[in-house]
């Protein structure tokens, strides 16, 4: 058993049928010594007397807030939370494994540039009773410091006969250090609380491996005399580093016509200028990426040819 | 150059093969065998190798003021892994395929490190780390993460490199 | 259909040389290891050397000067030879792949059936 | 060496129930975060069986109640329910050093 915060606790269970659980003593606080008793949750059912109540908690009829009164005063509250594990492996019933990039994909973060901010979010199809807390570090053993936000509901969507909630939090690093190679990963831990359940969520990573550009922005056409070729010249993010001379982006440049099916022509380019053929009903994009690592393309911005 | 005495650099001639190290350290990257264990192996392998950290001088104002500090960092990096790179960890079982760009990867980054620091200077470098791996899976694992490492490594000497060409050169 | 054969003498005489030859079918010896397991009868399993896809060799410090594991690629064979045998090498002997390095970190994911190996005079 | 001790010799369970086998390695089996221990399943008159590779992956075609888990020294086979098929001797492998190393087995029965 862990104290999660201030009068919260979290009892760690193997769960599989016949377990035998875990044996808690929950200490009552207050310096009364006599005349004590304990109730779980709404019942006025006396579990107990004395300062100490000691149970064993097998299952979540065992967890709830245990609560100790002395002459119809309330003394102190503990609640005791249950954190499953089954097979050697902690229960992951909260959130849902979003299987991008890889199984067991539970936060998934991003970052638009290397300023050391980045945000996070998450799936769950629990709408109700659903608490969420965020720490984050930089390393585990000699942490440095990141501040995040308060997690927020940042969509909703329907998937079949389910809703789905998208969970989303911000995150800044304290003392961001943009040109540097990172040699410590950020940590970032979620804990989960629905109803009686305890989960916590955890990822690790780079910023440089999150990289995702906001899309190239000014996206202009300018077509060249006596030719079926345009110009098309585009401009960074703002949210992109800078200066750009160091922090630069490669871009892709795309002409795709209306049907899918059609044959897309593609240029790779350094510059924020490319020439094109531009085809009737086609549209041309754009797209960046941090052009001396390999980290996720931006979404296109589009104009259409016409 | 980076002639001692803190003359300047070829800022063109080491763009052009930093961003050719970048290219070569991405290809080389999945070509090294298929891999799981990349997934799982996530405790550190490179604590060891020489990061190029905040006070290491290689932001833009850093390079500005001073840009031996940087230039020597980078320096010891390629070295240490062009050392990496011609050690049993690639060269033992399992066997490169032979085409595998991990060869001119190690030669380009000979050849940046001989532009930095011209015959008869020497900056200190620093040791490899005894990874011993014994298996070959353990080899496979540590070519992937060396190459990872490397790939962040040589994004930072590239942002060096391009941002010096644009502000630095003659 | 991976599949890997054990063959060889069923009988020898102390002082002996043992030979056993593996065949496989269903992969090339060029991707994959193959270990030497043995089992002594009721008793527990022993590894005894292992060749790999490059053609280099491990072999288990106990017993590493009686044995020589070698292979032929284009026939799919790898051989065991195992030089003064002694009684107390009577065991089942099995050839096993080594699982693709990249996902199995040295588990064994195929066995032969195992030849049994007595030594008598 | 690496010396693997699995715990107990043997074990008789209820069908349903469930089996835990323990496998403690002298020294540590992981290189970098894998864990190279390894679990087969043998049964009589066969070769040995994969069932699980590095401490936890399930091999294809095992059936989900076999589980893995530990790290380091320490590891753990569990069959969540066990059937009467999974009668048998389970033995753990390490491959993190040579030699490669077993375990000296665990016979699991039906109480």
């Known amino acids: 058993i862990w104290e999660l915060k201030k009068d919260v606790y979290v009892v760690e269970l193997d769960w599989y049928p016949d377990a035998p659980g875990e044996m808690v003593v929950l200490t009552c606080d207050t310096p009364e010594e006599d005349g004590i008793t304990w109730t779980l949750d709404q019942s006025s059912e006396v579990l107990g007397s004395g300062k100490t109540l000691t149970i064993q908690v097998k299952e979540f009829g065992d967890a709830g807030q245990y609560t100790c009164h002395k002459g119809g005063e309330v003394l102190s509250h503990s609640l005791l939370l249950l954190h499953k594990k089954e097979d050697g492996i902690w229960s992951t019933d909260i959130l849902k494994d979003q299987k991008e990039p890889k199984n067991k994909t539970f936060l998934r973060c991003e970052a638009k540039n290397y300023s050391g901010r980045f945000t996070c979010w998450w799936l769950t199809t629990i709408s109700t009773d659903l608490t969420f807390s965020v720490k984050s570090s930089r390393g585990s053993s000699d942490p440095q410091g990141v501040t995040c936000g308060a997690a927020t509901l940042s969509a909703e969507r329907v998937r079949g006969d389910n809703k789905e909630y998208e969970y989303s939090v911000e995150c800044q690093e304290d003392s961001a250090c943009p040109a540097a190679e990172e040699s410590l990963p950020i940590e970032v831990m979620v804990d989960a609380v629905h109803k009686l359940k305890y989960e916590n969520y955890t990822s690790s990573f780079f910023i440089r491996d999150i990289i995702k550009p906001d899309p190239p922005k000014n996206l202009q056409l300018k077509p060249l005399k006596n030719s079926r070729q345009v110009e098309v010249s585009w401009e960074y993010p703002d949210t992109w580093s800078t200066p750009h001379s160091y922090f630069s982006l490669t871009f892709c440049v795309q002409v795709q016509g209306k049907s899918k099916r059609e044959k897309k022509d593609r240029v790779f380019t350094d510059k924020t200028s490319a020439t094109v053929i531009c085809r009737k009903n086609a549209s041309i994009s754009v797209r960046a990426q941090d052009r001396y690592y390999s980290s996720s393309w931006s979404e296109w911005a589009s104009v259409p040819c016409s | 150059r980076a002639v001692p005495g803190g003359s300047s650099p070829a800022w063109t001639q080491c763009q052009q093969l930093s961003q050719k190290l970048c290219t070569l350290a991405w290809s080389a990257h999945p070509l090294v065998g298929h891999m799981d264990l990349r997934e799982e192996g996530d405790e550190e392998t490179t604590n060891d190798v020489p990061h190029i950290q905040c006070g290491d001088g290689c932001d833009p104002q850093g390079l500005r003021d001073n840009s031996q500090f940087c230039l020597q960092r980078i320096h010891q990096g390629l070295i240490f892994y062009e050392k990496l790179l011609g050690s049993d960890i690639f060269t033992g079982e399992p066997s490169l395929l032979p085409d595998s760009p991990v060869g001119q990867l190690h030669a380009s980054l000979l050849g940046l490190s001989q532009l930095l620091q011209p015959e008869g200077h020497h900056w200190e470098t620093q040791q490899i780390p005894s990874l011993s791996p014994s298996q070959p899976w353990q080899r496979l694992l540590l070519r992937f993460k060396i190459l990872r490492s490397l790939q962040a490594f040589v994004a930072v000497a590239a942002r060096v490199f391009a941002h010096g060409a644009a502000t630095l050169s003659p | 259909q991976v599949t890997l054969k054990e063959s060889g003498p069923v009988l020898v005489k102390p002082t002996e040389t043992l030979t056993l030859t593996c065949t496989v079918s269903g992969f090339s010896l060029t991707q994959y290891a193959i270990s030497w397991v043995r089992q002594p009868p009721g008793k527990g399993l022993e590894w005894l050397g292992v060749i790999w896809t490059g053609g280099g060799t491990n072999y288990n410090s106990g017993i590493k000067s009686r044995l020589t594991i070698s292979k032929d690629n284009s026939k799919s064979q790898v051989v065991l030879t195992m030089t003064n045998m002694d009684p107390v090498d009577t065991a089942r002997y099995y050839c096993?792949?080594?699982?693709?390095?990249?996902?199995?970190?040295?588990?064994?994911?195929?066995w032969g059936q195992g030849t049994t190996v007595t030594v008598s005079s | 060496d690496i010396v693997l001790t699995q715990s107990p010799d043997s074990l008789a369970v209820s069908l349903g129930q469930r089996a835990t086998i323990n496998c403690r390695a002298s020294?540590?089996?992981?290189?970098?975060?894998?864990?190279?221990m390894h679990w087969f399943q043998q049964k009589p008159g066969q070769p040995p069986k994969l069932l699980i590779y590095r401490a936890s992956n399930l091999e294809s075609g095992i059936p989900a109640r076999f589980s893995g888990s530990g790290s380091r020294t320490d590891f753990t086979l569990t069959i969540s329910s066990l059937q009467a098929e999974d009668v048998a001797v389970y033995y753990c492998q390490q491959a993190n050093k040579d030699p490669y190393t077993f375990g000296g087995g665990t016979k699991v029965e039906i109480k």
């Open positions: 096993v792949r080594e699982g693709d390095y990249g996902s199995y970190a040295g588990a064994m994911d195929y």
């Open positions: 020294e540590s089996v992981d290189y970098y975060g894998i864990s190279s």
